[in-house]
């Protein structure tokens, strides 16, 4: 996110992506914000409200069940990732309101904008873990009966979090505050010190590990899962299909603009018109990616309503039904409806 880029040899241009730049004005000089920034602020506000409340509710519902229910462990970890990211939003919001001025210091600059990337990696790795769990339940039910337990689920989550932290380190390390003078302000961004190769490498790794590879593997994984469950009369459910597709698709849909603009900007000359256009859209792309942090509770509630007929239950009990039902491996090696529905709930989009 926020970054520096020297759009021509020398001009202090703040671009919000992953480079440091100089030849366009460091910031718009108008008192009014640009339209993409206004849209980003609206999205941030909505995401913050829905994300904090929704994920707090999910954490509350799943925390009690996480000792014994594996699905609750998955949803708890996903909600924690989303909740953490949402906590950075008031700061990011304030910075955009102040035309990207960053009065919060160097430590905050390194940590807070990196949270969305931590969320991206944590979510996609947790999603991959959940998908592996779903896959094993369908194709290796006997193994699951013997080895699938809460302890293993927690270990898998710990590994996912550890890898996510590791993958976030490059952005964290390159993130710096920079004082600007015309106009006077402090900017928070990523400084690759004119090393375009390093910038491209970070962008490519982010695209491949955080988007393309998961997209490929999860598409294959869910194709197999859905083909198997679809072929069994007892588990044929358009609801299941819809929810699983919604959950996995949400991650890729909302991260797509950020990933595309990020990779394009790393290959474009900072003085090019396309770069400058993409640069103006950056806050909007970040805010769009942030929708991932509030979409899961919405999907859970919509799924819950669908499975319950109408919203007759209280929100917590509805969520409890959706998030804490345990997948039972039957001797028939097929799922019960509830198992498939639970699986559908959220194989979480990162």
């Amino acid at each position: 996110m926020n970054s520096f880029n020297y759009t021509t040899p020398d001009y202090g241009h703040y671009d919000d992506k992953d480079t440091l730049d100089l030849n366009t004005p460091v910031d718009k000089t108008s008192n009014t914000l640009r339209v993409p920034d206004i849209l980003a602020l609206v999205i941030f506000a909505v995401v913050f409200l829905v994300g904090v409340l929704g994920n707090a509710l999910v954490v509350w519902v799943t925390a009690f069940e996480a000792k014994r229910t594996i699905n609750a462990i998955w949803f708890l970890n996903l909600a924690v990732a989303d909740f953490l990211s949402c906590l950075a939003l008031p700061i990011l919001f304030t910075s955009i309101v102040q035309h990207h001025h960053w009065p919060f210091g160097g430590a905050a600059c390194s940590i807070l904008p990196s949270l969305i990337l931590l969320n991206m990696y944590a979510s996609i790795l947790l999603l991959a873990t959940i998908s592996a769990d779903r896959f094993l339940l369908v194709f290796k039910p006997i193994w699951c009966q013997n080895f699938r337990g809460a302890g293993l689920a927690w270990i898998a989550c710990a590994v996912a979090w550890g890898l996510a932290l590791l993958l976030t380190i490059p952005s964290f390390l390159y993130r710096v505050v920079r004082e600007e003078y015309f106009p006077p302000k402090v900017l928070c961004g990523v400084d690759y010190s004119h090393d375009k190769r390093r910038e491209r490498a970070v962008a490519i790794v982010r695209l491949v590990l955080g988007f393309l590879w998961p997209l490929l593997t999860l598409t294959i994984c869910y194709t197999f899962i859905l083909l198997r469950t679809w072929s069994r009369r007892a588990t044929r459910s358009t609801k299941t299909l819809k929810v699983v597709v919604a959950v996995v698709a949400s991650f890729f849909i909302f991260w797509l603009p950020y990933q595309v603009t990020g990779i394009m900007m790393s290959f474009l000359e900072p003085s090019s018109p396309t770069f400058l256009l993409l640069n103006k859209l950056d806050s909007l792309c970040v805010s769009f990616a942030y929708i991932n942090c509030c979409i899961n509770p919405i999907i859970y509630v919509v799924a819950g309503q669908g499975f319950q007929g109408r919203l007759r239950k209280s929100l917590p009990s509805l969520l409890r039904n959706v998030l804490t039902e345990e997948s039972v491996v039957r001797e028939s090696k097929s799922f019960t409806r509830s198992t498939v529905d639970t699986m559908a709930q959220k194989t979480q989009a990162v």
Epitope: G12, N31, Y181, F182, P184
Partner: antibody, heavy 116, light 107 residues
Framework: DVQLQESGPGLVKPSQSLSLTCTVT?????????WNWIRQFPGNKLEWMGY???????SYNPSLKSRISITRDTSKNQFFLQFYSVTTEDTARYYC?????????WGQGTTLTVSS | DIQMTQSPSSLSASLGEKVSLTCRAS??????LSWLQQKPDGSIKRLIY???TLDSGVPKRFSGSRSGSVYSLTISSLESEDFADYYC?????????FGGGTKLEIR
């Protein structure tokens, strides 16, 4: 109190190179702010030339970029303006100034005359 | 680059008189404007920054204001040391640019 003092050769011939020095007292050039060069032509027109920031980041006026360079010596608390291949058009009074919120402190200026 | 058009280019006034100098920006500069005073010996001093904020040590008779893209420096009651050259400067983006200056002379 922050004080800036320019010094330079005064008179140079066209196509020669030169260096102007700004010595800062009462403030470290590595603490914060940007340290600028500005010139004033005989007709009184002022032109910003460029700066070196406290962190060493440099920015130039695009119209001058290929002909100047700004450097510093932190041990002496000085920064410099190097001029390559001067012309008579570069005859002016050269000021160094600190930028934090606009240019808040200025030197007295040093006159440079380019003449054969 | 943003053009700063300063007027008048010269002005004659008497001691105790009230005078106003104006500066018009060719683009929005959002109040990122300073007023500078240059004495006959060439020394330059900042009087006002952020369009209307007085620098410390600057007499209260100096004031800055803004109306849209037009910025003004007003001296409420001229004193002998005020006769000098005045420049406006924007620092809203790169490169910062200066007005052409106003020469304030004793009538």
């Amino acid at each position: 109190d922050v004080q800036l003092q320019e010094s330079g050769p005064g008179l140079v011939k066209p196509s020669q190179s030169l260096s102007l020095t700004c010595t800062v007292t009462g403030y470290s050039i590595t603490s914060d702010s940007a340290w600028n060069w500005i010139r004033q032509f005989p007709g009184n027109k002022l032109e910003w030339m460029g700066y070196i920031s406290y962190s060493g980041r440099i920015s130039y006026n695009p119209s001058l970029k290929s002909r100047i360079s700004i450097t510093r010596d932190t041990s002496k608390n000085q920064f410099f303006l190097q001029f390559y291949s001067v012309t008579t058009e570069d005859t002016a009074r050269y000021y160094c100034a600190r930028a934090s919120i606009g240019f808040d402190y200025w030197g007295q200026g040093t006159t440079l005359t380019v003449s054969s | 680059d943003i053009q700063m058009t300063q007027s008048p280019s010269s002005l004659s006034a008497s001691l105790g008189e009230k005078v106003s100098l104006t500066c018009r920006a060719s683009q929005e500069i959002s109040g990122y404007l300073s007023w500078l005073q240059q004495k006959p010996d060439g020394s330059i001093k900042r009087l006002i920054y952020a369009a209307s904020t007085l620098d410390s040590g600057v007499p209260k008779r100096f004031s800055g204001s803004r109306s849209g893209s037009v910025y003004s420096l007003t001296i409420s009651s001229l004193e002998s040391e005020d006769f000098a050259d005045y420049y406006c400067l924007h620092y809203a983006n790169y490169p910062p640019t200066f007005g052409g200056g106003t020469k304030l002379e004793i009538r």
